[in-house]
Interface confidence: low
């Protein structure tokens, strides 16, 4: 492969916003490879060498009064300006989450399992995901992937609940997000529909069989008792 | 007090590759970058271009200054080259996977430098290029880089995927594998037993019950026909 030595210069002009644009901090940062060597910080008001490598630049740039004035004004002319231009599609961007709940492993009931609450495609990243079992919040056994940035202005996160699902239990994943006016909830019941229908079929069939058997025996023996004294002797039907 | 939002205009220039990048970042997401070859602004989401504009020529001027600064710093550092930092690679999907439901595989390449990387998607071991897309090199707070590669796909049990990453910090290409993990249906043993037993007992009960009902009714009818002696 290509084994030639590499040399990298990075520059980062940063605008940090607090409480909208009420407080703004501007940083002008220069890097050689990953090492920052000189910076302008609006909280300081002049360039400072971060390492010895940046001392010549700090001295030279601080001697240029026009440049310093320009950098001192950057919180307004650059930061607040760009914030205003981009605000409607960045700061105000809201995309609501898609929420799906499923068991991580397909285990039978009463076996240790991991219930997954998959929250996808939302923006911004601030999100609150909670697990509830039969209406009670579950705080232990909750594991999260943390916030995952998809790189396309959406986020996703998986929040898992370690549990032993029991028949009839209702698990609820509750999501709160700036795009939602009220929390979004998705339920998972501790019995699959096929399992439920099998149980119903079995129990239903059993009960129906017992009813028929009971009715049959009742009718048969009632008639046996009711006519026993009236039967003519010697003849069998 | 933690800031609410951060906007970063990030630039780099790399020698001897003579590659440069100019991009704007909002809270870790790219707003746009400038295509140096085409000299045009490329918005990360098409809709952004309807809200704002950026003159690409300004970025080219900045990159020229970055190049000049790099040459000064290279000499000043006594030609100290960069130390390669190999990437961490993760493959994930855009949303929960369902068979034959369109989805997107995301290959997340993180914590590396210098910003040069070769990424290939493999389906069943063969390179795939249809529909693939990627981001530019995205800045990190530790001044290393991140990058995303995307592959739209239709999940199936037959196909396996790999994201192959080559970087100077790696001794050999790094492959991250992904395949559809088909959930096996629950055994439902108890339910099956209850269902089978219940239906069997039910059926037997219905048959025997019906026989008894018929016999009982016949007996009743016979007795009524004969009447008392």
């Amino acid at each position: 492969g290509d084994t030639r030595p590499r040399f990298l210069e990075q520059v980062k002009h940063e605008c940090h916003f607090f409480n909208g644009t009420e407080r703004v901090r501007f940083l002008d940062r220069y890097f050689y490879h990953q090492e920052e060597y000189v910076r302008f910080d609006s909280d300081v008001g002049e360039y400072r060498a971060v390492t010895e490598l940046g001392r010549p630049d700090a001295e030279y740039w601080n001697s240029q009064k026009d440049l310093l004035e320009q950098k001192r004004a950057a919180v307004d002319t650059y930061c607040r300006h760009n914030y205003g231009v981009g605000e409607s599609f960045t700061v105000q961007r809201r995309v609501y989450p898609e929420v799906t709940v499923y068991p991580a492993k397909t285990q039978p009931l009463q076996h240790h399992n991991l219930l997954v609450c998959s929250v996808n495609g939302f923006y911004p990243g601030s999100i609150e995901v909670r697990w509830f079992r039969n209406g009670q919040e579950e705080k232990t056994g909750v594991v999260s992937t943390g916030l995952i940035q998809n790189g396309d202005w959406t986020f996703q996160t998986l929040v898992m609940l370690e549990t032993v699902p029991r028949s009839g239990e209702v698990y609820t994943c509750q999501v709160e997000h700036p795009s939602l006016t009220s929390p979004l909830t998705v339920e998972w019941r501790a019995r699959s529909e096929s399992a439920q229908s099998k149980m119903l079929s079995g129990v239903g069939g059993f009960v129906l069989g017992l009813l028929f058997l009971g009715a049959g025996l009742f009718i048969y023996f009632r008639n046996q008792k009711g006519h026993s004294g009236l039967q003519p002797t010697g003849f069998l039907s | 007090i933690k800031e609410e939002h951060v906007i970063i205009q990030a630039e780099f220039y790399l020698n001897p590759d003579q590659s440069g990048e100019f991009m704007f970042d909002f809270d870790g997401d790219e707003i746009f970058h400038v295509d140096m070859a085409k000299k045009e602004t490329v918005w990360r989401l098409e809709e952004f271009g309807r809200f704002a504009s950026f003159e690409a020529q300004g970025a080219l001027a900045n990159i020229a200054v970055d190049k000049a600064n790099l040459e000064i710093m290279t000499k000043r550092s006594n030609y100290t080259p960069i130390t390669n930092v190999p990437p961490e690679v993760t493959v994930l999907t855009n949303s929960p996977v369902e068979l034959r439901e369109p989805n997107v595989l995301i290959c997340f390449i993180d914590k590396f430098t210098p910003p040069v990387v070769n990424v290939t998607w493999l389906r069943n071991g063969k390179p795939v290029t249809t529909g693939v897309s990627e981001t530019v090199f995205l800045p990190r707070e530790d001044h290393l880089f991140r990058k995303f590669h995307y592959l739209p796909f239709l999940p199936s049990t037959e196909d396996v995927y790999d994201c192959r990453v080559e970087h100077w910090g790696l001794d050999e290409p790094l492959l991250k594998h992904w395949e559809f993990d088909a959930p096996s249906p629950l055994p439902e043993t108890t339910e099956n037993v209850v269902c089978a037993l219940g239906l069997t007992v039910g059926l037997v009960g219905i048959i025997i019950g019906t026989i008894f009902i018929i016999k009982g009714v016949r007996k009743s009818n016979a007795a009524e026909r004969r009447g008392p002696l």
Partner: antibody, heavy 118, light 108 residues
Amino acid sequence: QVQLVESGGGLVQPGGSLRLSCAASGFTFSSYAMSWVRQAPGKGLEWVSAISGSGGSTYYADSVKGRFTISRDNSKNTLYLQMNSLRAEDTAVYYCARGYGRYSPDLWGQGTLVTVSS
Amino acid sequence: DIVLTQSPATLSLSPGERATLSCRASQSVSSSYLAWYQQKPGQAPRLLIYGASSRATGVPARFSGSGSGTDFTLTISSLEPEDFAVYYCQQYSNLPFTFGQGTKVEIK
């Protein structure tokens, strides 16, 4: 052809229940989010509820939350709206609509009229 | 909730004239998630524009959408007799999704 057909509308007393169905044909039903939108007589459109393609995510307007339940059966290509505790203000034509992108309906049924009156 | 206000409530124009319908949001809406619909009496709504400016399949070129942030516009460059109807805008950016109250385009 590509179409949506609603059914299940009718006259119901306040506090009563009704289940609307929407049969889809001519497209891969499971690939699309679906919505219910209603229109009170002589009034504008009001979004009621939406459900993702897999049925994993459901969304409701505040006015129906807790009373209405949206669901789908992808094997039957059918969308449902279970409406409980109906009120007079729920009287409307209910449209079933196919989502486009993030639920912008691009295909609509002809609607089914629900009248809540004593 | 995001409130969409359409203006004017009624627009009286003649065939061949240009119609400009406005839709204003109470807060910023991502333009990817704004749609326009046409509804004629006794019929279901029909999607005209999605993503603020993309024409839906089969929609004539005389219909165009524009705008961003809080202000969106539907323009019918030259009204045809079949264009007289009620037009609604809808945002599907934030839950709950909301519609404007509608603009009726009637024959003058």
